[in-house]
Amino acid sequence: SERCDDWGLDTMRQIQVFEDEPARIKCPLFEHFLKFNYSTAHSAGLTLIWYWTRQDRDLEEPINFRLPENRISKEKDVLWFRPTLLNDTGNYTCMLRNTTYCSKVAFPLEVVQKDSCFNSPMKLPVHKLYIEYGIQRITCPNVDGYFPSSVKPTITWYMGCYKIQNFNNVIPEGMNLSFLIALISNNGNYTCVVTYPENGRTFHLTRTLTVKVVGSPKNAVPPVIHSPNDHVVYEKEPGEELLIPCTVYFSFLMDSRNEVWWTIDGKKPDDITIDVTINESISHSRTEDETRTQILSIKKVTSEDLKRSYVCHARSAKGEVAKAAKVKQKVPAPRYTVELACGFGAT
C-alpha cells in the first residue's frame, strides 16, 4: 500500500479507563496532529479506520464492531466501549485515508480494575482548593458526551470509601461538589459515580480526583528571606570552609515559579572563577507553602573571598527580594607569649 504518515505511538496520551464502564475515545489525529477536524475530513472523502494490537502481541488486527449489544462501536471520530473489558487493553490506531492520502497515530489504552473503595492504578488529576477561602467547588470530570442532556443521571459523591452525606462543610450538588470552607482535613480522593440509563441498560462512570488544600492567595506574601540576616556574621579565617545558607519562605501561589539564587560581587556563581558549590533543598508545608534553602559553599576561602559581597536573591509571582550575608575575616587572636613579652617591655 502507499506510504502513510505515521505519527507513531502517542505515549503522551496514555488513556486509562475503568473495567466494565463505558469509554469514549476520540481519535487523537484531529485533536493534536492534523489541522482539520473530522467533519472536514469526512466531507473531503476521507475514511477513518480503527485497528488495535492486543497487550503483549505484535499483530495488528481490525477491531470487531460486530460484538453482541454493539459493545464496541465507532461514531464519527469516537471509538465507543459499552462497556470495557479487561482484555481491551492494548495499543489502538486510528488511520485517516483515501486513495491519495493517509495519516495514522497509535495510542495506548489501559483498562484498569478498581476495588470497592475506588482504589486503582489510575493516575488521578489533582484539584487544588484554597484553604479557608469561601465557597469553592470541584466538578465531576470527563463525563461530557456520554449521555444526551435529556437524560438526568444520578450522581453519588464519595470521599475515599465513604458516601458524602451530611459531611458538614462539603455539599454534593449533582455534578458539582461544593466546599463551604476547605480545610486540611478535606485533603483526599473524591469520587463521583455517575449512573445513567441507555437502551434499557444501566451504565456507571467512575471518576476520582485528588483534592489538595493549599495556601490562599489572600494570605500570599512576597518571598521572605530568613537567612542570611543581620544577626548572623560569617567570620572565617583564610583556608577555612565558608558555608552560607540562603533560606527563603514562599507562600503558595498557583502556577508561580519560585526562584532562589546567589550573586557574588553582583555576578552569578557560574560567571566567576571562585571554586564555589551550591546545594539546594526544598520542603513544603501542608498547604504547599515552600521553603527553599541554597547553601553556598567555598571549601578553602581566601582573604579575597572574604571581602566579596554575597547576596541571596528570591523571586516569586508576588515580588523579588534580596539580602546580603555579613561575611568578614576573623582577626587572629594575639599569641599569649608575644603578648606577655610586649607587656614586660621585652625586645
Epitope: 484554597y130 479557608e132 477561602y133 469561601g134 465557597i135 467547588r137 451530611n166 459531611f167 458538614n168 462543610n169 455539599i171 454534593p172 450538588e173 449533582g174 458539582n176 461544593s178 463551604l180 470552607i181 490562599s216 489572600k218 494570605n219
Partner: antibody, heavy 122, light 110 residues
Framework: EVQLEESGGDLVQPGGSLRLSCAAS?????????MCWVRQAPGKGLEWVSC?????????YYANWAKGRFTISRDNSKNTLYLQMNSLRAEDTAVYFC?????????????WGQGTLVTVSS | DIQMTQSPSSLSASVGDRVTITCQAS??????LAWYQQKPGQAPKLLIY???LLASGVPSRFSGSGSGTDFTLTISSLQPEDFATYYC????????????FGQGTKVVIK
Amino acid sequence: EVQLEESGGDLVQPGGSLRLSCAASGFSFSSSHYMCWVRQAPGKGLEWVSCIYAGSSGNTYYANWAKGRFTISRDNSKNTLYLQMNSLRAEDTAVYFCARVDASSSGSWDLWGQGTLVTVSS
Amino acid sequence: DIQMTQSPSSLSASVGDRVTITCQASESIYSNLAWYQQKPGQAPKLLIYAASLLASGVPSRFSGSGSGTDFTLTISSLQPEDFATYYCQSASYSTGPDWTFGQGTKVVIK
C-alpha cells in the same frame, strides 16, 4: 449569651444612603462562619441580600438585585458586620436581619438578630 | 435564579393535628433546604437544615424530608407555641451562590 444585634436602621429619603451594623457577642467571627444580611418588607416574606465569608479571604456574595447598590463588609477585630446601602428606593423599606451561617454544619443559618427597620420615604 | 414555591400559603389547624407544609424548587437543589419558624416581631428560627437534619434545641415533633425539587416539613402533633409562619430556604452553592426563601406558610388556630 450568643447573639447578634443590628443597628443603624432609620428613615431615609429615596436616593439616600445608610450603613447598618450588626454586633456579635458570645462568639467570634471565624473561618467557619459566613455572615449574612436578609431583609423582610412589611407583611412580606424573607429575602436574601448578601453574605461575606468571615475567614481571611473575606469573599463576598450578593443577590443579583443588590449588586452595585449594597456593599457588605466586616471588621473581625470588632466582631461587627456592616451593610452599606446606597441609592435607596421605597422598595428597600424592610426590617434588615443579620444572620450567621455555620459552614461546618452544612451551611445552616443557625443564629439571627432581631432586625433593624429601614424606611425609605420622602 | 431558583424559585421556591411553598404551599399552602396559610392553613388552619388545631392543637394535636399533624401538619404538613410542602416546598417545591424550580430546579434540583439536592438536599440544600432549610425550614424556619417566625413569630410576629421576632427573627426567624432555624428548625431543619440539609432537608432533614433537626437543628439544635428543636423539638422532635418537627421533621423534614425530600430531595431534589420536592420537600416537606411535618409537625407531628401541633402545639400552641407552633402557631407561626414557616419559611423554606434553598441554597445553591455551585452556581452563585444563591439563597432563596419560599413565600411562607402561616399556620393559624382553627
